[in-house]
Interface confidence: medium
């Protein structure tokens, strides 16, 4: 806590500028008006304040806005954002995507901090759903963002937002998450033709039921092994040898490499040996 002391004569700040870097902490506290700071927040980032000086500036804003900062200030926090605690951020009402982008930019290249997680949570809750633009922004900064959400949170993602999802955004999703996302993707891409549809839906197939895999097997899709290995075991088990052969196309030869791993191992055990033999891969049920 900085002591309340009078500002020395002639030191009262008329604007936020570089001269303030020479102010001691107590001088900043005494000589910088909080309202001036709030209106000129955009200048703070251009000035090489020390961490201790930034603490003083934060303290002044906290005093001015005890109920939480207005968005006009939040948007220009810049590196001061790194000084905020999750408790501070919970008081905010962030509605502008530009504000969100500006603050994510500050944390760019780092792991998602508790502050960022709280900010995103506040933003999404404020919007009521994860719309496409928000999802685009969040996955650009944090490719694993989507898979960090619970199935319940994912249920608020509208199908239209699925267009913003890239394959790498789903890399760390577990089957429960894909179970939620797959029906949305199916709805989002339903008007695409066969081959284009498969390219788009491929990343989501870890949530696909058996009947959809059977339908895909009739469309000559040539699914690659990486995709096949991510399918739900319970969805793969009822597939016939002929259906798997059609689903994988030439990649069926790769089943040999995967015969000891799920879902291939479990699927093999469900098949008649005569049927497996038709593949010519030496698979033993």
């Amino acid at each position: 806590e900085v002591e309340k002391t009078a500002c020395p004569s002639g030191k009262k700040a008329r604007e936020i500028d570089e001269s303030l870097i020479f102010y001691k902490k107590w001088e900043l506290e005494a000589c910088v008006d909080a309202a001036l700071l709030a209106t000129q927040m955009d200048r703070v980032n251009a000035i090489p304040f020390t961490y201790e000086q930034l603490d003083v500036l934060k303290h002044k804003l906290d005093e001015l806005y005890p109920q939480g900062y207005p968005e006009s200030v939040i948007q220009h926090l810049g590196y001061l954002f790194l000084k905020m605690s999750p408790e501070d951020i919970r008081k905010w009402n962030v509605t502008s995507l530009e504000t969100l982008k500006a603050l994510l930019e500050v944390n760019k290249g780092h792991e998602m901090s508790p502050q960022v997680a709280t900010l995103i949570d506040r933003f999404v809750k404020g919007r009521g759903q994860l719309d496409k633009d928000t999802l685009d922004t969040l996955t650009a900064f944090y490719p694993g963002y989507l898979c960090s959400l619970s199935p319940e949170e994912l249920s608020s993602v509208p199908p239209s937002s699925i267009w913003a999802v890239r394959p790498q955004d789903l890399d760390t999703c577990d089957p429960r998450q894909l179970d939620v996302l797959y029906p949305k993707a199916r709805l989002a891409f339903q008007n695409m033709n066969g081959s284009e549809y498969f390219v788009k839906i491929q990343s989501f197939l870890g949530g696909a039921p058996t009947e959809d895999l059977k339908a895909l097997s009739q469309q000559n899709v040539s699914m690659d092994l990486a995709t096949f290995m991510k399918l739900r075991t319970d969805a793969v088990l009822p597939l016939t040898v002929a259906e798997v052969q059609k689903l994988l196309g030439p990649h069926v030869e790769g089943l040999k490499a995967e015969e000891r791993h799920r879902p291939v191992r479990d699927w093999i055990l469900r098949q008649r040996q005569d049927d497996l033999d038709t593949l010519g891969l030496g698979l033993q049920g």
Partner: antibody, heavy 115, light 107 residues
């Protein structure tokens, strides 16, 4: 006996086109995938394109996408690689290879792109 | 795209030597890795598929193994006809990718 024989290589100017053929014998092209793989002089192998005639699926390396087209005529048991907008960096020996495991290869045909 | 990083790029060995060539995938490719041998002016020949399965007609001195994303081709006792360039290749994802090659030369 399985055999793959490539043809159609030669000298072509930058921006020009060539069509390579891969005549297959000893197996039914319809039920096997086919690849084109190339090797620039003194360099390593680079996968170029793939077709599975059974399904019509095709895939391409990023370096040739939009310029090269792979196709197959199962009645002639022959795979093709249509190469348009050729560049100097496409100069290489082009091989066709059979199957997911690339178990059989042709002898290769040289494509030289030069002005 | 998946990168297959092969090492060494070349090695010198004598007849009878045990030779090991490694290939590291930039991400998991399971066991879907093949090894090929190529001699100057000739087409490549398949030696190993599915990381460790010996292709028919290939001498048993050739073997393949996998440890996570690391793949190894071993020639237990180098023969005169084994001096060539060796390539690994993954077929787990489109697009198929080859390693940059290892040239095995006579010491």
């Amino acid at each position: 006996e399985v055999q793959l024989v490539e043809s159609g290589g030669g000298l072509v100017q930058p921006g020009g086109s060539l069509r390579l053929s891969c005549a297959a014998s000893g197996f039914n092209l319809y039920s096997y995938s086919m690849h084109w793989v190339r090797q620039a002089p003194g360099k390593g192998l680079e996968w170029v394109a793939y077709i599975y005639p059974y399904s019509g699926s095709t895939y391409y390396a990023d370096s040739v996408k939009g310029r090269f087209t792979i196709s197959a005529d199962t009645s002639k048991n022959t795979a093709y690689l249509q190469m348009n907008s050729l560049r100097a960096e496409d100069t290489a020996v082009y091989y066709c290879a059979r199957g997911y495991g690339m178990d059989y290869w042709g002898q290769g045909t040289l494509v030289t792109v030069s002005s | 795209d998946i990168q297959m990083t092969q090492s060494p790029s070349s090695l010198s060995a004598s007849v009878g030597d045990r030779v090991t060539i490694t290939c590291r995938a930039s991400q998991s490719v399971s066991s879907a890795v093949a090894w090929y041998q190529q001699k100057p002016g000739k087409a490549p020949k398949l030696l190993i598929y599915s990381a460790s399965s010996l292709y028919s007609g290939v001498p048993s001195r050739f073997s393949g193994s996998r440890s996570g994303t690391d793949f190894t081709l071993t020639i237990s006792s180098l023969q005169p006809e084994d001096f060539a360039t060796y390539y690994c290749q993954q077929s787990y994802y489109w697009l198929f990718t080859f390693g940059q090659g290892t040239k095995v030369e006579i010491k």
